[in-house]
Protein backbone atom coordinates (compact mmCIF):
# COMPACT_ATOMS: atom_id res chain seq x y z
CA UNK A 1 0.00 0.00 0.00
CA UNK A 2 0.92 3.68 -0.16
CA UNK A 3 1.95 5.15 3.17
CA UNK A 4 2.03 8.76 4.28
CA UNK A 5 3.93 8.87 7.55
CA UNK A 6 3.57 11.24 10.48
CA UNK A 7 6.58 13.09 9.07
CA UNK A 8 4.87 13.54 5.67
CA UNK A 9 7.13 11.05 3.92
CA UNK A 10 5.31 9.27 1.12
CA UNK A 11 6.24 5.67 0.36
CA UNK A 12 4.89 2.72 -1.53
CA UNK A 13 5.43 -0.41 0.50
CA UNK A 14 5.26 -4.04 -0.50
CA UNK A 15 5.04 -5.17 3.12
CA UNK A 16 3.09 -8.41 3.26
CA UNK A 17 1.39 -9.98 6.27
CA UNK A 18 0.80 -8.27 9.61
CA UNK A 19 2.69 -5.05 10.37
CA UNK A 20 2.39 -2.47 13.16
CA UNK A 21 1.08 0.81 11.78
CA UNK A 22 0.93 2.56 15.17
CA UNK A 23 2.20 1.29 18.51
CA UNK A 24 2.26 3.68 21.44
CA UNK A 25 1.16 3.75 25.06
CA UNK A 26 -2.47 4.46 24.17
CA UNK A 27 -3.14 2.81 20.87
CA UNK A 28 -2.03 -0.09 18.75
CA UNK A 29 -2.93 -0.38 15.07
CA UNK A 30 -1.94 -3.41 13.04
CA UNK A 31 -2.57 -3.94 9.34
CA UNK A 32 -2.47 -7.10 7.28
CA UNK A 33 -1.48 -6.62 3.65
CA UNK A 34 -1.97 -9.15 0.86
CA UNK A 35 -0.73 -9.22 -2.75
CA UNK A 36 -3.19 -7.54 -5.11
CA UNK A 37 -2.49 -10.18 -7.77
CA UNK A 38 -0.94 -13.64 -7.52
CA UNK A 39 2.82 -13.25 -7.47
CA UNK A 40 2.60 -9.47 -7.22
CA UNK A 41 5.03 -7.42 -5.16
CA UNK A 42 2.36 -4.74 -4.70
CA UNK A 43 0.11 -5.33 -1.70
CA UNK A 44 -3.05 -3.74 -0.31
CA UNK A 45 -4.64 -3.77 3.13
CA UNK A 46 -7.05 -6.62 3.74
CA UNK A 47 -7.37 -6.45 7.53
CA UNK A 48 -7.05 -3.78 10.21
CA UNK A 49 -6.99 -4.19 13.98
CA UNK A 50 -7.06 -1.22 16.35
CA UNK A 51 -6.58 -1.68 20.08
CA UNK A 52 -7.49 1.27 22.28
CA UNK A 53 -5.72 0.60 25.55
CA UNK A 54 -7.31 0.96 28.96
CA UNK A 55 -6.95 4.63 30.00
CA UNK A 56 -7.59 5.95 33.50
CA UNK A 57 -11.29 6.59 34.18
CA UNK A 58 -12.00 7.22 30.52
CA UNK A 59 -12.04 3.96 28.57
CA UNK A 60 -11.74 0.23 28.97
CA UNK A 61 -9.57 -1.62 26.47
CA UNK A 62 -11.49 -1.77 23.20
CA UNK A 63 -10.66 -3.64 20.01
CA UNK A 64 -11.86 -2.66 16.56
CA UNK A 65 -11.39 -5.04 13.66
CA UNK A 66 -12.17 -4.56 9.98
CA UNK A 67 -11.63 -7.01 7.13
CA UNK A 68 -12.36 -7.10 3.42
CA UNK A 69 -16.15 -6.91 3.02
CA UNK A 70 -16.63 -6.40 6.74
CA UNK A 71 -16.42 -2.84 8.03
CA UNK A 72 -18.29 -2.92 11.33
CA UNK A 73 -19.56 0.18 13.10
CA UNK A 74 -18.80 -1.30 16.52
CA UNK A 75 -15.96 -2.74 18.56
CA UNK A 76 -15.54 -6.51 18.61
CA UNK A 77 -17.54 -6.71 21.85
CA UNK A 78 -20.48 -5.03 20.10
CA UNK A 79 -20.15 -1.71 21.92
CA UNK A 80 -19.86 1.68 20.24
CA UNK A 81 -18.11 3.60 23.01
CA UNK A 82 -15.37 3.21 25.63
CA UNK A 83 -17.27 0.96 28.03
CA UNK A 84 -18.59 1.54 31.54
CA UNK A 85 -16.17 4.12 32.84
CA UNK A 86 -16.99 7.71 33.74
CA UNK A 87 -15.55 9.08 30.52
CA UNK A 88 -16.65 6.27 28.19
CA UNK A 89 -18.05 8.68 25.62
CA UNK A 90 -14.59 10.02 24.97
CA UNK A 91 -14.25 7.03 22.61
CA UNK A 92 -16.95 6.70 19.94
CA UNK A 93 -17.52 4.93 16.64
CA UNK A 94 -19.68 6.61 14.00
CA UNK A 95 -20.81 4.93 10.81
CA UNK A 96 -20.62 7.50 8.01
CA UNK A 97 -21.55 5.22 5.10
CA UNK A 98 -22.77 1.73 5.88
CA UNK A 99 -20.11 -0.86 5.12
CA UNK A 100 -17.83 1.74 3.52
CA UNK A 101 -16.82 4.50 5.90
CA UNK A 102 -16.33 4.53 9.67
CA UNK A 103 -14.96 7.26 11.91
CA UNK A 104 -13.57 6.63 15.39
CA UNK A 105 -13.13 9.57 17.76
CA UNK A 106 -10.82 9.04 20.73
CA UNK A 107 -11.17 12.43 22.43
CA UNK A 108 -9.20 11.38 25.50
CA UNK A 109 -6.08 11.22 23.30
CA UNK A 110 -7.19 13.88 20.81
CA UNK A 111 -7.26 11.33 18.01
CA UNK A 112 -9.53 10.79 15.01
CA UNK A 113 -9.33 7.66 12.87
CA UNK A 114 -11.03 7.11 9.52
CA UNK A 115 -11.37 3.60 8.12
CA UNK A 116 -12.83 2.98 4.68
CA UNK A 117 -13.48 0.05 2.44
CA UNK A 118 -12.83 1.05 -1.16
CA UNK A 119 -13.33 -1.79 -3.61
CA UNK A 120 -12.00 -4.95 -1.98
CA UNK A 121 -9.43 -3.25 0.23
CA UNK A 122 -9.24 -1.03 3.31
CA UNK A 123 -7.81 2.44 3.78
CA UNK A 124 -6.74 4.03 7.04
CA UNK A 125 -6.17 7.65 8.10
CA UNK A 126 -5.47 9.16 11.49
CA UNK A 127 -5.07 12.58 13.08
CA UNK A 128 -3.08 12.40 16.28
CA UNK A 129 -1.28 14.89 18.55
CA UNK A 130 2.51 14.85 18.41
CA UNK A 131 2.86 13.91 22.03
CA UNK A 132 0.57 10.92 21.65
CA UNK A 133 2.65 9.82 18.66
CA UNK A 134 5.72 10.15 20.89
CA UNK A 135 4.18 8.46 23.93
CA UNK A 136 6.33 5.38 23.59
CA UNK A 137 7.75 3.97 26.79
CA UNK A 138 10.02 1.38 25.25
CA UNK A 139 11.44 2.89 22.05
CA UNK A 140 13.35 -0.27 21.36
CA UNK A 141 10.31 -2.49 20.98
CA UNK A 142 7.53 0.03 20.27
CA UNK A 143 9.21 2.67 18.17
CA UNK A 144 9.53 0.82 14.87
CA UNK A 145 5.98 1.29 13.67
CA UNK A 146 5.20 2.21 10.06
CA UNK A 147 3.43 5.53 10.62
CA UNK A 148 6.45 6.85 12.49
CA UNK A 149 9.39 5.15 10.80
CA UNK A 150 8.02 4.31 7.37
CA UNK A 151 8.55 0.90 5.88
CA UNK A 152 11.97 -0.76 5.62
CA UNK A 153 13.99 0.25 2.58
CA UNK A 154 13.93 -3.28 1.21
CA UNK A 155 10.12 -3.20 1.41
CA UNK A 156 9.72 -0.03 -0.64
CA UNK A 157 8.71 0.22 -4.29
CA UNK A 158 10.07 3.22 -6.17
CA UNK A 159 6.75 4.06 -7.76
CA UNK A 160 7.90 7.49 -8.84
CA UNK A 161 10.55 5.90 -11.07
CA UNK A 162 7.88 3.49 -12.27
CA UNK A 163 5.66 6.47 -13.11
CA UNK A 164 8.48 8.16 -15.05
CA UNK A 165 9.15 4.95 -17.00
CA UNK A 166 5.46 4.59 -17.73
CA UNK A 167 5.27 8.13 -19.08
CA UNK A 168 8.18 7.47 -21.37
CA UNK A 169 6.72 4.35 -22.88
CA UNK A 170 3.32 5.83 -23.66
CA UNK A 171 0.58 3.26 -24.00
CA UNK A 172 2.92 0.29 -24.15
CA UNK A 173 2.61 -2.31 -21.44
CA UNK A 174 5.26 -2.17 -18.74
CA UNK A 175 5.55 -5.79 -17.75
CA UNK A 176 9.27 -5.42 -17.18
CA UNK A 177 9.03 -2.23 -15.14
CA UNK A 178 5.97 -3.32 -13.22
CA UNK A 179 6.44 -4.65 -9.70
CA UNK A 180 3.60 -7.04 -10.44
CA UNK A 181 2.74 -9.45 -13.20
CA UNK A 182 0.69 -7.63 -15.81
CA UNK A 183 -2.91 -7.53 -14.67
CA UNK A 184 -5.53 -9.15 -16.90
CA UNK A 185 -7.17 -5.80 -17.70
CA UNK A 186 -4.34 -3.35 -17.14
CA UNK A 187 -5.07 0.14 -18.48
CA UNK A 188 -2.97 1.76 -21.16
CA UNK A 189 -0.99 4.59 -19.60
CA UNK A 190 -3.13 7.33 -21.17
CA UNK A 191 -6.35 5.77 -19.86
CA UNK A 192 -4.92 5.47 -16.35
CA UNK A 193 -3.84 9.10 -16.45
CA UNK A 194 -7.27 10.23 -17.67
CA UNK A 195 -9.13 8.25 -14.99
CA UNK A 196 -6.87 9.59 -12.25
CA UNK A 197 -7.07 13.18 -13.54
CA UNK A 198 -10.87 13.04 -13.24
CA UNK A 199 -10.70 12.51 -9.52
CA UNK A 200 -7.29 14.01 -8.75
CA UNK A 201 -6.69 17.08 -10.91
CA UNK A 202 -3.53 18.08 -9.02
CA UNK A 203 -0.55 16.00 -10.17
CA UNK A 204 0.74 15.26 -6.71
CA UNK A 205 1.85 11.96 -5.18
CA UNK A 206 -1.77 10.89 -4.66
CA UNK A 207 -2.33 11.28 -8.38
CA UNK A 208 0.88 9.37 -9.10
CA UNK A 209 -0.17 6.64 -6.67
CA UNK A 210 -3.48 6.40 -8.51
CA UNK A 211 -1.73 5.97 -11.87
CA UNK A 212 0.63 3.39 -10.40
CA UNK A 213 -2.26 1.40 -8.94
CA UNK A 214 -4.25 1.39 -12.17
CA UNK A 215 -1.24 0.34 -14.23
CA UNK A 216 -0.38 -2.35 -11.69
CA UNK A 217 -3.82 -3.83 -11.11
CA UNK A 218 -6.28 -2.57 -13.67
CA UNK A 219 -8.71 -2.07 -10.76
CA UNK A 220 -10.47 1.27 -11.12
CA UNK A 221 -11.42 1.22 -7.42
CA UNK A 222 -7.87 2.28 -6.61
CA UNK A 223 -8.70 5.67 -8.16
CA UNK A 224 -11.28 6.14 -5.43
CA UNK A 225 -8.85 4.90 -2.79
CA UNK A 226 -6.37 7.65 -3.70
CA UNK A 227 -9.18 10.21 -3.95
CA UNK A 228 -10.57 9.38 -0.50
CA UNK A 229 -7.07 9.23 0.99
CA UNK A 230 -6.56 12.82 -0.14
CA UNK A 231 -10.01 13.81 1.14
CA UNK A 232 -9.08 12.34 4.52
CA UNK A 233 -5.85 14.34 4.51
CA UNK A 234 -7.86 17.49 3.86
CA UNK A 235 -10.04 16.70 6.84
CA UNK A 236 -7.33 15.46 9.20
CA UNK A 237 -4.06 17.23 8.39
CA UNK A 238 -3.41 20.31 10.51
CA UNK A 239 -1.04 21.95 8.03
CA UNK A 240 -3.09 22.96 5.01
CA UNK A 241 0.11 23.78 3.09
CA UNK A 242 1.08 20.13 3.20
CA UNK A 243 -2.08 18.55 1.81
CA UNK A 244 -0.46 17.79 -1.53
CA UNK A 245 2.90 16.08 -1.55
CA UNK A 246 5.06 16.24 -4.65
CA UNK A 247 7.89 14.23 -6.08
CA UNK A 248 11.22 15.44 -4.79
CA UNK A 249 14.80 14.36 -4.34
CA UNK A 250 15.42 11.36 -2.08
CA UNK A 251 13.99 11.87 1.37
CA UNK A 252 15.02 10.44 4.69
CA UNK A 253 14.50 6.73 4.11
CA UNK A 254 11.83 5.20 6.28
CA UNK A 255 13.87 2.19 7.14
CA UNK A 256 12.31 0.47 10.10
CA UNK B 1 19.03 1.38 22.54
CA UNK B 2 17.50 4.83 22.35
CA UNK B 3 17.95 5.56 18.65
CA UNK B 4 14.21 5.85 18.07
CA UNK B 5 14.07 8.55 20.70
CA UNK B 6 16.55 10.48 18.54
CA UNK B 7 14.29 9.96 15.53
CA UNK B 8 11.32 11.15 17.52
CA UNK B 9 13.11 14.26 18.76
CA UNK B 10 14.22 15.10 15.22
CA UNK B 11 10.67 14.62 14.03
CA UNK B 12 9.34 16.74 16.86
CA UNK B 13 11.80 19.54 16.01
CA UNK B 14 10.94 19.53 12.32
CA UNK B 15 7.16 19.17 12.36
CA UNK B 16 4.11 20.68 13.97
CA UNK B 17 2.47 24.05 13.74
CA UNK B 18 4.74 26.12 16.00
CA UNK B 19 7.12 27.58 13.42
CA UNK B 20 8.31 24.21 12.19
CA UNK B 21 11.76 23.94 10.71
CA UNK B 22 10.99 23.75 7.02
CA UNK B 23 13.36 21.86 4.78
CA UNK B 24 15.14 24.99 3.54
CA UNK B 25 15.80 26.82 6.79
CA UNK B 26 18.88 26.99 9.04
CA UNK B 27 16.61 25.49 11.72
CA UNK B 28 16.30 22.32 9.67
CA UNK B 29 20.08 21.95 9.55
CA UNK B 30 20.28 22.67 13.27
CA UNK B 31 17.70 19.94 13.91
CA UNK B 32 19.69 17.58 11.69
CA UNK B 33 22.90 18.28 13.62
CA UNK B 34 21.05 17.57 16.88
CA UNK B 35 19.81 14.33 15.33
CA UNK B 36 23.35 13.42 14.28
CA UNK B 37 24.68 14.13 17.77
CA UNK B 38 21.92 12.13 19.41
CA UNK B 39 22.56 9.26 17.02
CA UNK B 40 26.29 9.33 17.67
CA UNK B 41 25.62 9.09 21.39
CA UNK B 42 23.62 5.90 20.87
CA UNK B 43 26.35 4.17 18.84
CA UNK B 44 27.64 2.11 21.77
CA UNK B 45 24.25 0.62 22.52
CA UNK B 46 22.64 0.61 19.06
CA UNK B 47 25.42 0.01 16.53
CA UNK B 48 24.28 -3.51 15.70
CA UNK B 49 20.65 -2.55 15.16
CA UNK B 50 18.99 -1.62 11.88
CA UNK B 51 17.35 1.52 13.26
CA UNK B 52 20.77 2.98 14.08
CA UNK B 53 22.20 2.39 10.61
CA UNK B 54 19.02 3.71 8.99
CA UNK B 55 19.29 6.91 10.99
CA UNK B 56 22.98 7.35 10.20
CA UNK B 57 22.44 6.91 6.45
CA UNK B 58 19.32 9.05 6.52
CA UNK B 59 21.16 11.90 8.23
CA UNK B 60 23.99 11.71 5.70
CA UNK B 61 21.45 11.84 2.86
CA UNK B 62 19.64 14.84 4.32
CA UNK B 63 22.84 16.67 5.23
CA UNK B 64 24.04 16.53 1.63
CA UNK B 65 20.58 17.19 0.15
CA UNK B 66 20.14 20.36 2.16
CA UNK B 67 23.78 21.44 2.09
CA UNK B 68 24.00 21.42 5.87
CA UNK B 69 27.46 21.85 7.36
CA UNK B 70 28.51 19.34 10.01
CA UNK B 71 29.41 22.18 12.37
CA UNK B 72 26.95 24.75 13.62
CA UNK B 73 24.12 25.27 16.09
CA UNK B 74 21.83 22.46 17.22
CA UNK B 75 18.15 22.62 18.20
CA UNK B 76 16.10 21.52 21.17
CA UNK B 77 13.04 19.28 20.76
CA UNK B 78 9.64 20.39 22.04
CA UNK B 79 8.09 17.73 24.24
CA UNK B 80 5.44 17.64 26.95
CA UNK B 81 4.36 14.71 29.05
CA UNK B 82 0.93 13.07 28.93
CA UNK B 83 -0.51 11.42 32.01
CA UNK B 84 0.41 7.75 32.19
CA UNK B 85 -1.63 5.20 30.28
CA UNK B 86 -3.47 2.48 32.14
CA UNK B 87 -5.46 2.74 35.35
CA UNK B 88 -4.19 5.48 37.63
CA UNK B 89 -4.60 5.27 41.38
CA UNK B 90 -5.71 8.88 41.56
CA UNK B 91 -9.31 9.42 40.52
CA UNK B 92 -10.53 12.79 39.34
CA UNK B 93 -14.16 13.86 39.21
CA UNK B 94 -13.34 16.20 36.38
CA UNK B 95 -14.12 14.83 32.91
CA UNK B 96 -11.29 16.98 31.54
CA UNK B 97 -8.83 14.12 31.75
CA UNK B 98 -11.00 12.40 29.14
CA UNK B 99 -10.87 15.37 26.81
CA UNK B 100 -7.35 15.75 25.49
CA UNK B 101 -7.64 19.31 24.23
CA UNK B 102 -9.15 20.59 27.45
CA UNK B 103 -6.47 18.94 29.55
CA UNK B 104 -3.81 20.10 27.10
CA UNK B 105 -4.82 23.76 27.37
CA UNK B 106 -3.92 23.64 31.04
CA UNK B 107 -0.31 23.05 30.04
CA UNK B 108 0.20 24.95 26.82
CA UNK B 109 -1.32 26.24 23.62
CA UNK B 110 -3.07 24.17 20.97
CA UNK B 111 -1.46 20.75 20.53
CA UNK B 112 0.48 20.00 17.37
CA UNK B 113 -1.45 17.49 15.31
CA UNK B 114 -0.06 15.13 12.75
CA UNK B 115 -1.42 12.72 10.18
CA UNK B 116 -0.71 9.22 8.89
CA UNK B 117 -2.52 7.44 6.07
CA UNK B 118 -2.45 4.09 4.31
CA UNK B 119 -4.27 3.32 1.06
CA UNK B 120 -4.19 1.60 -2.32
CA UNK B 121 -1.44 -0.78 -3.43
Amino acid sequence: PHLRTFTDRFQTCKVQGAWPLIDNNYLNVQVTNTPVLPGSAATATSKLTIIFKNFQECVDQKVYQAEMDELPAAFVDGSKNGGDKHGANSLKITEKVSGQHVEIQAKYIGTTIVVRQVGRYLTFAVRMPEEVVNAVEDWDSQGLYLCLRGCPLNQQIDFQAFHTNAEGTGARRLAAASPAPTAPETFPYETAVAKCKEKLPVEDLYYQACVFDLLTTGDVNFTLAAYYALEDVKMLHSNKDKLHLYERTRDLPGRA
Amino acid sequence: CKILKCNSEFWSATSGSHAPASDDTPEFCAALRSYALCTRRTARTCRGDLAYHSAVHGIEDLMSQHNCSKDGPTSQPRLRTLPPAGDSQERSDSPEICHYEKSFHKHSATPNYTHCGLFGD
Epitope: - | R44, C46, L50
Partner: antibody, heavy 115, light 112 residues
Framework: EVQLVESGGGLVQPGGSLRLSCAAS????????MNWIRQAPGKGLEWIGM????????HYADSVKGRFTISRDNSKNTLYLQMNSLRAEDTAVYYC????????WGQGTMVTVSS | DVVLTQSPLSLPVTLGQPASISCRSS???????????LEWFQQRPGQSPRLLIY???SRFSGVPDRFSGSGSGTDFTLKISRVEAEDVGVYYC?????????FGQGTKLEIK
Protein backbone atom coordinates in the same frame (compact mmCIF):
# COMPACT_ATOMS: atom_id res chain seq x y z
CA GLU C 1 6.18 -10.94 23.99
CA VAL C 2 9.87 -11.34 23.23
CA GLN C 3 10.92 -14.98 23.28
CA LEU C 4 14.35 -16.51 22.71
CA VAL C 5 14.77 -20.27 22.80
CA GLU C 6 18.25 -21.80 22.66
CA SER C 7 18.87 -25.38 21.60
CA GLY C 8 21.68 -27.66 20.48
CA GLY C 9 23.53 -28.01 23.77
CA GLY C 10 24.82 -31.33 25.05
CA LEU C 11 27.89 -33.34 25.93
CA VAL C 12 30.89 -33.10 23.62
CA GLN C 13 34.50 -34.25 23.86
CA PRO C 14 37.41 -31.80 24.04
CA GLY C 15 38.40 -30.76 20.52
CA GLY C 16 34.88 -31.47 19.28
CA SER C 17 32.31 -29.16 17.70
CA LEU C 18 28.76 -28.11 18.46
CA ARG C 19 26.27 -25.76 16.85
CA LEU C 20 23.80 -23.88 19.01
CA SER C 21 20.63 -22.28 17.69
CA CYS C 22 18.48 -19.49 19.11
CA ALA C 23 14.92 -19.20 17.78
CA ALA C 24 13.53 -15.69 18.17
CA SER C 25 9.91 -14.52 18.23
CA UNK C 26 7.83 -11.61 19.49
CA UNK C 27 9.97 -8.93 17.83
CA UNK C 28 11.37 -8.10 14.40
CA UNK C 29 14.50 -10.26 14.59
CA UNK C 30 16.07 -8.78 11.44
CA UNK C 31 16.13 -5.31 13.05
CA UNK C 32 18.43 -6.16 15.94
CA UNK C 33 22.00 -7.02 16.75
CA MET C 34 22.20 -10.21 18.80
CA ASN C 35 24.59 -11.47 21.50
CA TRP C 36 25.80 -14.78 22.87
CA ILE C 37 26.72 -14.85 26.58
CA ARG C 38 27.71 -17.83 28.71
CA GLN C 39 27.77 -18.78 32.37
CA ALA C 40 30.03 -21.53 33.68
CA PRO C 41 28.46 -23.66 36.46
CA GLY C 42 28.33 -21.64 39.69
CA LYS C 43 30.19 -18.77 38.04
CA GLY C 44 29.43 -15.33 36.61
CA LEU C 45 28.46 -14.15 33.14
CA GLU C 46 30.89 -13.92 30.23
CA TRP C 47 30.15 -12.17 26.94
CA ILE C 48 31.08 -14.31 23.92
CA GLY C 49 30.26 -12.10 20.99
CA MET C 50 27.69 -10.21 18.96
CA UNK C 51 26.45 -9.96 15.38
CA UNK C 52 24.91 -6.96 13.61
CA UNK C 53 21.33 -7.08 12.32
CA UNK C 54 22.53 -7.77 8.76
CA UNK C 55 25.58 -9.91 9.65
CA UNK C 56 27.83 -7.11 8.34
CA UNK C 57 29.93 -7.13 11.50
CA UNK C 58 30.75 -9.68 14.18
CA HIS C 59 32.68 -9.11 17.38
CA TYR C 60 34.12 -11.79 19.65
CA ALA C 61 35.69 -12.12 23.08
CA ASP C 62 39.40 -12.99 22.94
CA SER C 63 38.71 -16.28 24.72
CA VAL C 64 36.70 -17.65 21.78
CA LYS C 65 38.20 -15.78 18.80
CA GLY C 66 39.11 -18.14 15.97
CA ARG C 67 37.14 -21.03 17.51
CA PHE C 68 33.58 -19.73 17.67
CA THR C 69 31.54 -18.25 14.81
CA ILE C 70 28.26 -16.36 15.17
CA SER C 71 25.83 -16.31 12.26
CA ARG C 72 22.15 -15.64 11.68
CA ASP C 73 19.37 -16.43 9.25
CA ASN C 74 16.90 -13.55 9.29
CA SER C 75 14.44 -15.43 7.10
CA LYS C 76 14.22 -18.09 9.83
CA ASN C 77 14.45 -15.70 12.80
CA THR C 78 17.35 -17.77 14.06
CA LEU C 79 20.75 -16.97 15.55
CA TYR C 80 23.57 -19.54 15.54
CA LEU C 81 26.78 -20.20 17.43
CA GLN C 82 29.20 -22.62 15.79
CA MET C 83 31.70 -23.83 18.39
CA ASN C 84 34.85 -25.65 17.25
CA SER C 85 37.95 -26.89 19.10
CA LEU C 86 35.97 -27.03 22.32
CA ARG C 87 37.81 -27.05 25.66
CA ALA C 88 36.79 -28.06 29.17
CA GLU C 89 36.62 -24.38 30.13
CA ASP C 90 33.88 -23.85 27.51
CA THR C 91 31.50 -25.85 29.72
CA ALA C 92 28.67 -23.45 30.51
CA VAL C 93 25.06 -22.48 29.98
CA TYR C 94 24.93 -20.50 26.72
CA TYR C 95 22.42 -17.67 26.40
CA CYS C 96 21.39 -15.66 23.38
CA UNK C 97 20.24 -12.12 24.04
CA UNK C 98 18.42 -9.51 21.95
CA UNK C 99 19.85 -6.15 20.99
CA UNK C 100 23.27 -4.56 20.66
CA UNK C 101 22.99 -4.10 24.40
CA UNK C 102 21.41 -7.32 25.70
CA UNK C 103 17.96 -6.67 27.12
CA UNK C 104 15.94 -9.88 26.74
CA TRP C 105 17.69 -13.23 27.24
CA GLY C 106 16.76 -16.81 26.40
CA GLN C 107 16.53 -19.54 29.01
CA GLY C 108 19.92 -20.97 27.99
CA THR C 109 21.24 -24.32 26.78
CA MET C 110 23.88 -26.36 28.63
CA VAL C 111 27.11 -27.34 26.91
CA THR C 112 29.38 -29.81 28.67
CA VAL C 113 32.88 -30.41 27.31
CA SER C 114 34.32 -33.51 28.90
CA SER C 115 36.07 -36.72 28.01
CA ASP D 1 39.45 -5.15 29.47
CA VAL D 2 37.38 -3.16 31.95
CA VAL D 3 37.11 -5.01 35.28
CA LEU D 4 33.92 -4.55 37.30
CA THR D 5 34.18 -5.35 41.01
CA GLN D 6 30.98 -5.87 42.96
CA SER D 7 30.56 -5.72 46.72
CA PRO D 8 29.42 -7.36 48.81
CA LEU D 9 29.53 -10.78 47.14
CA SER D 10 26.84 -12.00 49.54
CA LEU D 11 24.06 -9.85 50.94
CA PRO D 12 21.66 -11.22 53.58
CA VAL D 13 18.68 -8.87 53.99
CA THR D 14 15.54 -8.86 56.11
CA LEU D 15 12.25 -8.71 54.18
CA GLY D 16 10.99 -5.14 53.87
CA GLN D 17 14.44 -3.68 54.54
CA PRO D 18 16.54 -1.79 51.98
CA ALA D 19 19.51 -3.32 50.17
CA SER D 20 22.44 -1.74 48.37
CA ILE D 21 24.97 -3.27 45.97
CA SER D 22 28.12 -1.52 44.79
CA CYS D 23 29.86 -1.89 41.42
CA ARG D 24 33.30 -0.36 40.85
CA SER D 25 34.93 -0.07 37.47
CA SER D 26 38.67 -0.24 36.74
CA UNK D 27 38.25 2.80 34.46
CA UNK D 28 35.67 5.50 33.88
CA UNK D 29 32.53 4.37 32.08
CA UNK D 30 31.64 7.89 30.97
CA UNK D 31 31.91 8.58 27.24
CA UNK D 32 33.22 11.82 25.75
CA UNK D 33 29.56 12.82 25.23
CA UNK D 34 28.84 12.42 28.93
CA UNK D 35 26.87 9.18 28.64
CA UNK D 36 27.53 6.23 30.93
CA UNK D 37 26.57 2.76 29.78
CA LEU D 38 26.25 0.69 32.91
CA GLU D 39 23.43 -1.81 33.34
CA TRP D 40 22.16 -4.01 36.18
CA PHE D 41 20.74 -7.51 35.78
CA GLN D 42 18.88 -9.79 38.16
CA GLN D 43 19.20 -13.57 37.92
CA ARG D 44 16.71 -15.45 40.04
CA PRO D 45 17.57 -19.05 40.98
CA GLY D 46 17.20 -21.34 37.97
CA GLN D 47 16.32 -18.47 35.63
CA SER D 48 18.09 -16.43 32.98
CA PRO D 49 19.27 -12.87 33.66
CA ARG D 50 16.73 -10.07 33.40
CA LEU D 51 17.56 -6.43 32.68
CA LEU D 52 16.63 -4.12 35.57
CA ILE D 53 18.47 -0.84 34.99
CA TYR D 54 20.16 0.59 31.92
CA UNK D 55 22.37 3.66 31.53
CA UNK D 56 23.03 3.82 35.28
CA UNK D 57 19.57 4.87 36.43
CA SER D 58 16.84 4.15 33.83
CA ARG D 59 14.44 1.40 34.86
CA PHE D 60 13.67 -1.12 32.13
CA SER D 61 9.99 -1.65 31.29
CA GLY D 62 8.12 -3.75 33.84
CA VAL D 63 10.72 -3.30 36.59
CA PRO D 64 9.22 -2.31 39.98
CA ASP D 65 10.09 1.17 41.21
CA ARG D 66 11.67 -0.20 44.37
CA PHE D 67 14.75 -0.78 42.18
CA SER D 68 16.91 2.25 41.48
CA GLY D 69 20.37 2.86 40.08
CA SER D 70 22.81 5.68 40.65
CA GLY D 71 26.47 6.62 40.29
CA SER D 72 28.93 8.06 37.81
CA GLY D 73 32.45 7.61 36.49
CA THR D 74 33.72 4.46 38.22
CA ASP D 75 31.33 4.04 41.19
CA PHE D 76 27.79 2.73 40.81
CA THR D 77 25.06 1.50 43.12
CA LEU D 78 21.91 -0.58 42.79
CA LYS D 79 19.39 0.03 45.57
CA ILE D 80 16.29 -1.94 46.50
CA SER D 81 14.13 0.23 48.76
CA ARG D 82 12.19 -2.65 50.37
CA VAL D 83 13.34 -6.18 49.69
CA GLU D 84 10.65 -8.69 48.77
CA ALA D 85 10.90 -12.49 48.67
CA GLU D 86 10.94 -12.48 44.85
CA ASP D 87 14.11 -10.36 44.85
CA VAL D 88 16.26 -13.30 45.92
CA GLY D 89 18.96 -14.11 43.38
CA VAL D 90 22.26 -12.88 41.98
CA TYR D 91 22.68 -9.28 40.75
CA TYR D 92 25.22 -8.39 38.07
CA CYS D 93 26.46 -5.07 36.80
CA UNK D 94 27.56 -4.88 33.15
CA UNK D 95 29.35 -2.16 31.19
CA UNK D 96 28.88 -1.40 27.49
CA UNK D 97 31.03 1.74 27.26
CA UNK D 98 34.21 -0.11 26.31
CA UNK D 99 34.83 -3.21 24.19
CA UNK D 100 34.51 -5.95 25.15
CA UNK D 101 31.31 -5.87 27.15
CA UNK D 102 32.12 -7.07 30.70
CA PHE D 103 30.19 -8.15 33.81
CA GLY D 104 30.79 -7.88 37.53
CA GLN D 105 31.25 -11.16 39.38
CA GLY D 106 27.78 -10.98 40.93
CA THR D 107 26.21 -10.29 44.33
CA LYS D 108 24.02 -12.96 45.89
CA LEU D 109 21.03 -11.50 47.70
CA GLU D 110 19.35 -13.79 50.23
CA ILE D 111 16.72 -13.38 52.90
CA LYS D 112 17.89 -13.43 56.53
Amino acid sequence: EVQLVESGGGLVQPGGSLRLSCAASGFTFSNYGMNWIRQAPGKGLEWIGMIYYDSSEKHYADSVKGRFTISRDNSKNTLYLQMNSLRAEDTAVYYCAKGTTPDYWGQGTMVTVSS
Amino acid sequence: DVVLTQSPLSLPVTLGQPASISCRSSQSLETSDGDTFLEWFQQRPGQSPRLLIYEVSSRFSGVPDRFSGSGSGTDFTLKISRVEAEDVGVYYCMQVTHDPLTFGQGTKLEIK
